[in-house]
């Protein structure tokens, strides 16, 4: 066969639905690979073919569009499961084209199970909720284009296994679930089903999320430099360890970038000669704010090293501020001979 | 297309037990809950207990807690609801009733089961 | 356990009438509750599923209404064949508990 644009597997896009519900699978070349729609490439000519590898094999085969009730179809630029298999779990293949062009990309589809509380291996998207920041709503995800409008479906919402009713500060509203003021105690998993009749049968969407609530932007404030401090002298002979470190609380903020740096007499650490190691680690809190504690090193640390300026930056979408550690060389106790001889008027 | 079989008719003495089966077919057995609901001779509808066969769950009324046992064989597709100390009272058709979430979406053709001595 | 008590018991109506049927439960259902469909000698059908959804298959005559503790299944023109008792069953709290039944027969 001719030459073909092969995108390869497009791993990026692991897709994974449950097992016994419907799926549609956009083509991905479509989305992500070409710079044209379906309807532009059928209007020229162009056609779009699907096939698959089951998962453990090797050989490439067409896609079956001869089940019983059209388990499996082609519609435009979708492939529709009505419902999934656990076998049909595989790479799958979509390939656009005609006798002078050919385009195709592979994704790997995983049919998964769950259990009957909607546990599962499946990756779960997270929505962060802003702590008692008033009304807040999540949607029952990825589940346009299963149904027209004119059909109505039912919703119903879990916390974990458990239905949602009768919760203080919970409401399910249709594909909505409220939230009336988010607290710590509203952490967890949540799953919609949509229950839906198509040509006289009734089919489910199982949608899990995990809800995590997050630091207010009310209460945000700039970073917060707890060390070093006015407080702590770093005082040290020249041949000691120096250690000071840098903690500082960052306010949780929606994609904000936190930073923590070091300057040794305004240059960053990599750009001095000094034998200075820098280890870093971060702790969260239960509201995801963030505490950032970089830790300066010197092993041998010399008197010129005594005299330098130890600054510690911290920078976030609120602010940036910077803290100089106070250090000092220890003036050596006087030897008890010497102190005698002076004592004595000794020249 | 969904349908539950369900074993034949059973007449069965005052203190003993018994075991109806509910075979299962067009549709994933694994995914969906089993239930278990059973119908006194002109009466009403009484809920049993269910079983999720992915994982085993089972949830019973209080009723029947300690009496009736709800298992379920994947490789079959078949549940069972065994009942035991059979009284005369317990004389009634017996029916599976398979539901994706809690309603009882398809039921079995239900199993008579006559306590006679 | 939840008690659901429905009414009438029985009734007798002409071909195209509208039948209404009401179910009250013991304690608020938050519309977790489905309504069956059952002929005689015959299981039981899902007609109506979370108070108001239509099950697969199901005619549209039939239709569900409610909230909190009262709720009514509604055939808005008899037909023969809707001979049956209808059954409510809450699915809100287990153990799942259904009415006493509704006859409906026609005149």
């Known amino acids: 066969s001719e030459r073909c644009d092969d995108w390869g597997l497009d791993t990026m896009r692991q897709i994974q639905v449950f097992e016994d519900e419907p799926a549609r699978i956009k083509c991905p070349l479509f989305e992500h690979f070409l710079k044209f729609n379906y309807s532009t490439a059928h209007s020229a000519g162009l056609t779009l073919i699907w096939y698959w590898t089951r998962q453990d094999r090797d050989l490439e085969e067409p896609i079956n569009f001869r089940l019983p009730e059209n388990r499996i179809s082609k519609e435009k630029d979708v492939l529709w499961f009505r419902p999934t298999l656990l076998n049909d779990t595989g790479n799958y293949t979509c390939m656009l084209r005609n006798t002078t062009y050919c385009s195709k990309v592979a994704f790997p589809l995983e049919v998964v199970q769950k259990d009957s509380c909607f546990n599962s291996p499946m990756k779960l998207p997270v929505h962060k909720l802003y702590i008692e920041y008033g009304i807040q709503r999540i949607t029952c995800p990825n589940v346009d284009g299963y149904f027209p409008s004119s059909v109505k479906p039912t919703i119903t919402w879990y916390m974990g296994c458990y239905k949602i009713q009768n919760f203080n500060n919970v409401i399910p509203e249709g594909m909505n679930l409220s939230f009336l003021i988010a607290l710590i105690s509203n952490n967890g998993n949540y799953t919609c089903v949509v229950t839906y009749p198509e040509n006289g049968r009734t089919f489910h969407l199982t949608r899990t999320l995990t809800v995590k609530v997050v630091g207010s932007p009310k209460n945000a404030v700039p970073p917060v430099i707890h060390s070093p401090n006015d407080h702590v002298v770093y005082e040290k002979e020249p041949g000691e360890e120096l250690l000071i470190p840098c903690t500082v609380y960052f306010s949780f903020l929606m994609d904000s970038r936190n930073e923590v740096w070091w300057t040794i007499d305004g240059k960053k650490p990599d750009d001095i000669t000094i034998d200075v190691t820098i280890n870093e680690s971060i702790s969260h809190s239960r509201t995801e704010d963030e505490t950032r504690t970089q830790i300066l090193s010197i092993k041998k640390v010399t008197s010129e090293d005594l005299k330098r300026s130890y600054v510690c930056h911290a920078r976030s979408a609120k602010g940036e501020v910077a803290k100089a550690a106070k250090v000092k060389q220890k003036v050596p106790a006087p030897r008890y001979t010497v102190e005698l001889a002076c004592g004595f008027g000794a020249t | 297309q969904v349908q539950l079989v369900q074993s034949g008719a059973e007449v069965k003495k005052p203190g003993s037990s018994v075991k109806v089966s509910c075979k299962a077919s067009?549709?994933?057995?694994?995914?969906?809950?089993m239930n278990w609901v059973r119908q006194a001779p002109g009466k009403g509808l009484e809920w049993m207990g269910r079983?999720?066969?992915?994982?085993?769950?089972?949830h019973y009324a209080q009723k029947f807690q300690g009496r009736v046992t709800i298992t379920a064989d994947k490789s079959t597709s078949t549940a069972y609801m065994e009942l035991s100390s059979l009284r005369s009272e317990d004389t009634a058709v017996y029916y599976c009733?398979?539901?994706?979430?809690?309603?009882?979406?398809?039921w079995g053709q239900g199993t008579l089961v006559t306590v006679s001595s | 356990d939840i008690q659901m008590t429905q009414s009438p018991s029985s009734l007798s109506a002409s071909v195209g009438d509208r039948v209404t049927i009401t179910c009250q439960a013991s304690q608020g259902i938050n519309n977790y509750l489905n309504w069956y469909q059952q002929k005689p000698g015959k299981a039981p059908k899902l007609l109506i599923h979370y108070t108001s959804g239509l099950h697969a298959g199901v005619p549209s005559r039939f239709s569900g209404s409610g909230s909190g503790t009262d709720y009514t299944l509604t055939i808005s023109s008899l037909e023969p064949e809707d001979v049956a008792t209808y059954y409510c069953?809450?699915?809100?709290?287990?153990?799942?508990?259904f009415g006493g039944g509704t006859k409906v027969e026609i005149k």
């Open positions: 009733g398979e539901g994706y979430l809690d309603p009882m979406d398809y």
């Open positions: 067009g549709y994933t057995f694994t995914s969906s809950w």
């Open positions: 079983i999720y066969p992915g994982d085993g769950q089972t």
């Open positions: 069953q809450q699915y809100s709290i287990l153990p799942w508990t």
